[in-house]
């Protein structure tokens, strides 16, 4: 009975397996209602080809226990071969096979595009013994598929070491259409033309696309995807979405905000962050960009001061960091800051402008006409000097700094003073006899010490010699002086 | 890149046999049917038949039984078509191509040209 | 066997122009499940032939918007609505709701 199924294998009207009409009843319901289901048709082998290389589906015949017949070929019965359906639908597919009741340990497994379907898939085998066969029949169910579900399924059966392997079946979801490029948010120069691309697949194709500006179609007709709006330019900003059509229904793409780009807002916030007799640092916030980027930023700043000639100082630096170190500006000054960016439009308005203060600056000129005596008899050195003339700026004289080195045998010190500013003369102890001691004054203020005065040099003899005259710093360009007792 | 490569050209003898090959590659070759397809100089297209390489099922034009026997080998994800008794009447290009989910040939190889001549 | 008979063998063109290709099978290519498994092929010269439309209407992916398919049962439409020079070659229809698959005879777009 079994040779004359295997017969009767022409009666399958076209081609077994793959063939996507190949079933002998109608199966429409399978492939065009809402929730598909297999189907399954009667027992049957399927036919082997002649001269075919490798069985592949076909298990070997074998000899049963008595010795007495063979067994015929195993292999999958045919099934549909095709599936089309929709989206979020729920389908369910089988593979049969008969096997003789010799045979025991049988497993079917599932295989997707080459891959075993293992875990959270509703797989379900069911057994339908016989006297002499058992029929088994496995389905396959997916419960609202999705794209991910696209694929060639087949059943693999286990048995005796041999692995029996059905024709597929393939799964094509159809759905709404999905979008590969959507338009994005652009930001555009007034009056002028630019592009938006979208694009949007099945199956099923065509997909149509209908352009929506500010929630009203832009174009009659429909274009075919992929389709490429072009606005000849906006006055002010918009919003495009593209509707993507096919069989199944409609997607709308995300809304999208095209901007019209203008100069930037004035930065706010310009606050001070550090002081200096010579520089301030600032920094801001930068104001709205006018959607397009800041290119750079410039920092004003006027001297606030009834005599000084209004003009204004420009520094540019980047956009980024929103911090700026304005530098060159005088000691003990006030300042009127204000700062501005750019775009490729054009520079925003200026910030509102804040007031700014330099600290005291250090005095710009030495103490002048430094002189040095020795006074053996009390083993000190008389020094004096007159007070420099500071500018406003440098602040007040808060005293004097006095450096005296000392150098005798390859033997170096050099100590400080600090003397007070009413001060125009000081004593310092002789630290070395028959040494060398060179003295420098430099006034100081608030603001930090000023340059030292050039310096004046004095011989310490040792004990027993007396110094006369005195040491004092040189007329300009002379030499560094040496007095000589 | 799901791709098909085809052996290079043929010049046979008549009465002998030729063996063409298919590579497949950028898809899993074991699920997908496998099509040869004829096409003589200046001629239209003609369907010699298929086989599926997960199991080795084939299924003849009846125009080629006797003629073509396809085989396949899933370690090399190679397919073949072997022509045998050839005549002049089949020298021709020679096609594989994969029948894809949407039932349709998807991709093809850049064909293998057989000339059978003494 | 369903014969498939496609129309013009040669259609002389001027780039731009809408090109119109018929194919006519012997026998109804719908098949039980509804679906209707007629595609077309261009086969550009030295080329293999490539998918264009599958399932009659359907473009394949990367296809252009000119080419589009209709037609349903046994005759089938081409549409190419402009011409451009990289169509040129032979077209083909292949149906494969029934064994064995048959090509049309194929159809040569030619400039005029």
């Known amino acids: 009975a079994i040779t004359e199924a295997r017969e009767e294998a022409k009666p399958y009207p076209l081609f077994p397996g793959p063939l996507p009409g190949s079933l002998q009843t109608d199966h429409t319901s399978l492939l065009s209602l809402p929730h598909t289901s297999g189907y399954q048709p009667a027992l049957m082998f399927s036919p082997t080809q002649p001269g075919r290389p490798y069985t592949g589906n076909v298990a070997i015949p074998r000899v049963t226990s008595a010795g007495s017949k063979l067994l015929p070929p195993l292999a999958f019965k045919h099934t549909v071969g095709h599936i089309i359906l929709s989206e979020h639908k729920d389908v369910k597919f089988n593979c049969s096979i008969s096997v003789p009741n010799i045979y025991q340990d049988t497993t079917i497994s599932w295989w997707k595009d080459g891959k075993e379907l293992l875990g959270a898939h509703h797989a379900i085998t069911q057994f339908y013994p016989d006297d002499e066969v058992t029929a088994i029949i496995a389905s396959f169910s997916i419960t609202s598929v999705q794209r991910s579900d696209n694929g060639s399924y087949i059943c693999k059966m286990k048995i005796n070491n041999e692995e029996i392997v059905s024709d597929p079946i393939y799964i094509e979801v159809q759905g709404l259409p999905h979008f590969t490029k959507q338009p994005e948010s652009m930001n555009v120069t007034r009056n002028t033309a630019f592009n938006l691309t979208c694009q949007a697949v099945g199956p099923p194709e065509p997909v149509n696309i209908f352009w929506v500006q500010n929630s009203s179609r832009v174009n009659e007709q429909p274009e075919k995807s992929p389709s490429v709006l072009t606005v000849p330019g906006l006055t002010e900003m918009a919003v495009f979405s593209c509707e993507a059509h096919n069989d199944k229904g409609l997607t709308v793409s995300k809304g999208v905000q095209i901007n019209i780009k203008a100069i930037p807002s004035p930065p706010t916030e310009v606050s001070i962050h550090n002081s200096t007799a010579h520089s301030i640092l600032i920094s801001w916030v930068p104001g709205f960009d006018g959607y397009s980027p800041f290119r750079n930023c410039s920092v004003q700043v006027k001297e606030v001061d009834p005599l000084s000639n209004g003009s204004v100082m420009i520094f540019n630096t980047s956009a980024s960091p929103h911090m700026y170190q304005i530098k060159q500006l005088q000691a003990l000054a006030n300042y009127s800051i204000g700062v501005s960016c750019m775009n490729e439009i054009g520079w925003s308005a200026v910030s509102p402008w804040i007031l700014a203060s330099t600290t005291e600056g250090a005095p710009s000129v030495a103490p002048l006409n430094v002189t040095v005596f020795l006074n053996e008899s009390r083993d000190n050195v008389d020094i004096r000097w007159m007070k420099p003339l500071t500018k406003r700026q440098a602040g007040e004289l808060v005293g004097y700094r006095i450096s005296h080195v000392w150098q005798s045998a390859g033997i170096s010190k050099e100590l400080l003073e600090e003397v007070g500013q009413n001060n125009s003369r000081a004593q310092i102890s002789v630290q070395v006899h028959n040494a060398t001691c060179t003295v420098r004054i430099a006034a100081v203020t608030k603001g930090g010490v000023g340059p030292f005065s050039d310096p004046v040099k004095i011989f310490i003899p040792a004990h027993g010699w007396v110094d006369h005259a005195p040491s004092s710093t040189p007329a300009p360009g002379n030499a560094d002086p040496v007095l000589i007792i | 890149q799901d791709q098909l490569q085809q052996s290079g050209p043929e010049l046979v003898k008549p009465g002998a046999s030729v063996k063409i090959s298919c590579k497949a590659s950028g898809y899993s070759f074991t699920s997908y049917y496998i099509h040869w397809v004829k096409q003589r100089p200046g001629q239209g297209l003609e369907w010699v038949g298929w086989i599926f390489p997960g199991n080795g099922n084939t299924k003849y034009n009846e125009r080629f039984k006797g003629k073509a026997t396809l085989t396949a080998d899933t370690s090399s994800s190679t397919a073949y078509m072997q022509l045998s008794s050839l005549t002049s009447e089949d020298s021709a290009v020679y096609y594989c191509?994969?029948?894809?989910?949407?039932?349709?040939?998807?991709?093809w190889g850049q064909g293998t040209s057989v000339t059978v001549s003494s | 066997d369903a014969v498939m008979t496609q129309t013009p063998l040669s259609l002389p063109v001027s780039l731009g122009d809408q090109a119109s290709i018929s194919c006519r099978s012997s026998?109804?290519?719908?098949?039980?499940?509804?679906?209707?498994?007629l595609h077309w092929y261009l086969q550009k010269p030295g080329q293999s032939p490539q998918l264009l439309i599958y399932?009659?209407?359907n473009r394949f992916s990367g296809v252009l918007d000119r080419f589009s398919g209709s037609g349903s049962g046994t005759d089938f439409t081409l549409k190419i609505s402009r011409v451009e020079a990289e169509d040129l070659g032979v077209y083909f229809c292949?149906?494969?709701?029934?064994?064995?698959?048959?090509f049309g005879s194929g159809t040569k777009l030619e400039i005029k």
């Open positions: 191509a994969r029948l894809g989910l949407i039932y349709a040939l998807d991709y």
């Open positions: 292949l149906q494969v709701t029934h064994v064995p698959f048959t």
């Open positions: 399932r009659v209407s």
């Open positions: 026998q109804s290519l719908e098949n039980s499940n509804g679906n209707t498994y």
